[in-house]
Amino acid sequence: KFSKQSWGLENEALIVRCPRQGKPSYTVDWYYSQTNKSIPTQERNRVFASGQLLKFLPAAVADSGIYTCIVRSPTFNRTGYANVTIYKKQSDCNVPDYLMYSTVSGSEKNSKIYCPTIDLYNWTAPLEWFKNCQALQGSRYRAHKSFLVIDNVMTEDAGDYTCKFIHNENGANYSVTATRSFTVKDEQGFSLFPVIGAPAQNEIKEVEIGKNANLTCSACFGKGTQFLAAVLWQLNGTKITDFGEPRIQQEEGQNQSFSNGLACLDMVLRIADVKEEDLLLQYDCLALNLHGLRRHTVRLSRKNPSKECF
């Protein structure tokens, strides 16, 4: 539970925070988990502990392994583990999945891409940003503090974004890069007056007496997430539950689907053991949302038994 994955590239700075938190006054001891050997705190070492932080300045592939941190207070000790992996620099442009930080989503209204882990480092602006290894240029891109802002985001802006900055430790500079994917959400959702796809208005459905029959009410309400949208059945202008015919039941729960990006719902009316009197009823499929309600009416008719050849 108190283990954290951290990764970096060889010859870059990597700073790892102990997964167990404590007050700044608490002492934190770091160890190599494999050997239980204490990690020095002297800054002249390439790898050293600095309170809650473990610093690799710079990191080497051989540093990969599990590190233990123990947060010590007057009343308790808390143990955490940092699973560190240092990778060789890639010769090509592709950033492998194991070097990627969490994906972020943006939209026309909100297009900030934060540089991962930057708060652990002693860095000074400006940040350098790259998309798919190309330096970002143009007025649409603005490096602001620890994040990148993209104006007028388009779907083509999706991709892998790398931030590059310099960590300063006692006058020495170390390079750090971090990459994360950016996806663009289409926020062009809309809501419209319900459109009933099935049944057709004044449809006549053929049924067989004594058999079961299903009627499906299916409607679409717009694109994207819809607030207050429903489909339901009525019998002769009455709620199914109030009609009082146990043979006729509305399926519990509405099935949601996305057809061509449209948000649609459907509700099935199940009629068990169809009787003659069911043919006299009006079956109303109702679809409603914030704009209003639409009704399509269905009637049942007796299916002529198929003539058999003798």
């Epitope: 007056f193 208005q201 339901l232 009525q234 002769n236 202008g237 009455t238 709620k239 009006q282 109303d284 109702l286 409603l288 704009h291 209003g292 309600l293 639409r294 009704r295 399509h296 009416t297």
Partner: nanobody, 118 residues
Framework: ESGGGSVQSGGSLRLSCAAS????????MGWFRQAPGKEREGVAV????????YYADSVKGRFTISQDNAKKTLYLQMNSLKPEDTALYYC????????????????WGQGTQVTVSS
């Protein structure tokens, strides 16, 4: 329609609309209003079969539309009335396949005047 009248700001009124000559089920019924020099606007709408209601933003939380199936009567309870609620209020009904504040209604009442003074 009935129940209109004059009232002070913050007061209440209850409008009634008695329907006759048709079944009360499967109807879209609503209240509309028209202030002098303004277009008629939808206030509240109810689909009679399942008590589904729609309200104009300007009256949400203050007005309540309801029905009495047995009496075939539609009501509009108006609380916390404001001077801007002053208008001629109409009851309307429609048996078509649509129901909402923006639809065309086929049947209209004569209207009842509501005046709210500050």
């Amino acid at each position: 329609e009935s129940g209109g009248g004059s009232v002070q700001s913050g007061g209440s009124l209850r409008l009634s609309c008695a329907a006759s000559g048709y079944t009360f089920r499967r109807y879209c019924m609503g209240w509309f209003r028209q202030a002098p020099g303004k277009e008629r606007e939808g206030v509240a709408v109810l689909y009679t079969g399942v008590d589904i209601t729609y309200y104009a933003d300007s009256v949400k939380g203050r007005f309540t539309i309801s029905q009495d199936n047995a009496k075939k009567t539609l009501y509009l309870q108006m609380n916390s009335l404001k001077p801007e609620d002053t208008a001629l209020y109409y009851c309307a009904a429609d048996s078509g396949p649509l129901c909402g504040l923006g639809i065309q209604f086929g049947y209209w009442g004569q209207g009842t005047q509501v005046t709210v003074s500050s």
